[in-house]
Amino acid sequence: QHTCSISKVTSLLEVNCENKKLTALPADLPADTGILHLGENQLGTFSTASLVHFTHLTYLYLDRCELTSLQTNGKLIKLENLDLSHNNLKSLPSLGWALPALTTLDVSFNKLGSLSPGVLDGLSQLQELYLQNNDLKSLPPGLLLPTTKLKKLNLANNKLRELPSGLLDGLEDLDTLYLQRNWLRTIPKGFFGTLLLPFVFLHANSWYCDCEILYFRHWLQENANNVYLWKQGVDVKDTTPNVASVRCANLDNAPVYSYPGKGCPTSSGDTDYDDYDDIPDVPATRTEVKFSTNTKVHTTHWSLLAAAPSTSQDSQMISLPPTHKPTKKQSTFIHTQSPGFTTLPETMESNPTFYSLKLNTVLIPSPTTLEPTSTQATPEPNIQPMLTTSTLTTPEHSTTPVPTTTILTTPEHSTIPVPTTAILTTPKPSTIPVPTTATLTTLEPSTTPVPTTATLTTPEPSTTLVPTTATLTTPEHSTTPVPTTATLTTPEHSTTPVPTTATLTTPEPSTTLTNLVSTISPVLTTTLTTPESTPIETILEQFFTTELTLLPTLESTTTIIPEQNSFLNLPEVALVSSDTSESSPFLNSDFCCFLP
């Protein structure tokens, strides 16, 4: 019998020589070994030349072998996975020539103090790189340029003080980045580029909050659903986002994402997420929705109320800079949750920050009746382009929204997913979309209606129109928005049923009617009639804190007026605060948020 145990896994011969007190490679290894476990032995040094004749070798485990030296002087043409973790390596040789097929490299828990610039040259297939728990103080520029297929990068628990600005350039497939527990003070401007990173870990660093942190702050705000707190032994998919875990070391551990940046330059060069003003508007022809995978659901109820609109039109406006326009493809993750609730980022226990979010839909009165039917509402002829194409273009500085028609769809069986970002485009004519959001349009202060059409659809019989994306008001006249994704639903016992599917059409200026066409499950038989005399203003309002504390519903309204109709990626947004609410700190534009 062999020294090592032999089995087969997925057609590969697996040889397990773990913990056999070996000081060298066993002499009787099978020639067709595909998976070789040599961990927990006392090998000291290792040379790939000793394995060149094992032409099937695909996985090689050399963890906990007391390695102080690795020589790559023999080519292992099929090796895909190399585990060198928990050794005493102080340096790494160049690996590309010897291991051209490598997809996973684990050199975690070693004593690497630095990496040579070309150490990863030739590793064009590398998908996972684990370098956590070493003594890395810096990284060479261009380190990852050869590894364009990288999906997971772990640099946690090192001594990194800074990151090369172009470290992530070209890593279009990167989905997980671990940078926690380093000595990082800031993130270089443009570091993340246009990457959409579903899972990022950034806590336990020495983040220094001054004007240099504004790029990073803005990125955190834009990616709040993708920043997590790492926990030992817990799969990232089983945790909730925790953007508040990223804290200012110099400001009493206040969250970086809420750093006010008082006194910092407000020019686009300092605060822009990236220079997106140069990017032309492009007609969209397809709908793509990106979702975060959060499986622990933190819930909060949303209030739905009807109130008379404010008579005052006096407003204060805050101009906000463009938000991130993603260009990169990303996998779709389905996030399921119970209707009536929404997922919010999990946060630390201290430093509550309050935000208010309101969404107004003003229905101009008409004696329209909502009739429950069992068939899909047929769009008006003028709405037909919705199902074919949607061109989202508008003059840059226009203050009047251009008429647009947009639909955002979600996967068929999703129960109100929470998108992190979305590219608004339209589905093919053959598909019946189930949109969870719609273009927000409001009346100008002059009350002139803007001809805009939006379709709102909620999955399952529901009592609420469900827009799922909105922009939060930000602290202290901050020039950067705090974006969120929000699923708006009503509490179970709401007394005002809202149609499951409704087409809201704001008429041409010459018309004074708003038509509501509804498709309601046969179970819902309530008829909702819009009174002729009084306009109805439906307010969907949310208040939450980083501690998920619920606050009472307030009656004032904040209106969101897009200046360019590119919904979800609003290049510029004005937040209007009605001055009838000056008594409420939540709604006063001078004091929108409680900060720690």
Epitope: K8, T10, S11, L13, D32
Partner: antibody, heavy 118, light 113 residues
């Protein structure tokens, strides 16, 4: 046409030994992994051992240390040396050919009966 | 070891019937490297050796009639005979070829009603 013909079965006392053979034809024997699978009377199928084309043997725990699989590529023959036989080893033993490096069995012999009884 | 559980253990059916046999594994048989599920199905008639029908969950062995089909992923698998023929009355076994020791289900005997 692929053919696998087992031989060597018979009655043996507990603790005894037996050597089974499987003569292969109709394919390039040296290029394929080969296996032994058994079936106790009225029962289901149970894998006994395999040997890769390079000659590497592997076994389930139930026979490890008692059974030895081997092959002679020059004779196109597969062997199973069974020692320390037990009553529960009583079964029809099938020789089976694997498909390439995969481990499903695309051809089977007709089987040979091994009875372990005192 | 991976345990394989077949159901039902036996069933009675008539010629022309659609027959479905299920097989569950105690752990996933999906190989993430190639997205293949390592499951095979065999047919065995009394006094005869088993015959390979399907491998990698759904790939029909050469010469096997198209009325035999396999499906499933992860831990749940199905063998379907779309229209039972007289020669199909036999015992059917599933086998995982994901990791050794290779293990079989206990078998499903398809009898004439």
């Amino acid at each position: 046409e692929v053919q696998l013909v087992e031989s060597g079965g018979g009655l043996v006392q507990p603790g005894g030994s037996l050597r089974l053979s499987c003569a292969a034809s109709g394919f390039t024997f040296s290029s394929f992994a080969m296996s032994w699978v058994r079936q106790a009377p009225g029962k289901g199928l149970e894998w006994v051992s395999s040997i890769t084309s390079a000659g590497t043997p592997y076994y389930p725990d139930s026979v490890l240390g008692r059974f030895t699989i081997s092959r002679d590529n020059s004779k196109n023959t597969l062997y199973l040396q069974m020692n320390s036989l037990r009553a529960e080893d009583t079964a029809v033993y099938y020789c089976a050919k694997s498909r390439g490096y995969e481990d499903y069995f695309d051809y089977w012999g007709q089987g040979t009966l091994v009875t372990v009884s005192s | 070891d991976i345990q394989m559980t077949q159901s039902p253990s036996s069933l009675s059916a008539s010629v022309g019937d659609r027959v479905t046999i299920t097989c569950k594994s105690s752990q996933s048989l999906l190989n993430s490297r190639n997205q293949k599920n390592y499951l095979a199905w065999y047919q065995q008639k009394p006094g005869k050796a088993p015959k390979l029908l399907i491998y990698f969950t759904s790939t029909r062995e050469s010469g096997v009639p198209s009325r035999f089909s396999g499906s499933g992923s992860g831990t749940d698998f199905t063998l379907t005979i779309s229209s039972l023929q007289p020669e199909d009355f036999a015992t059917y076994y599933c086998q995982q070829h994901y990791s050794s020791p290779w293990t079989f289900g206990q078998g499903t005997k398809v009898e004439i009603k």
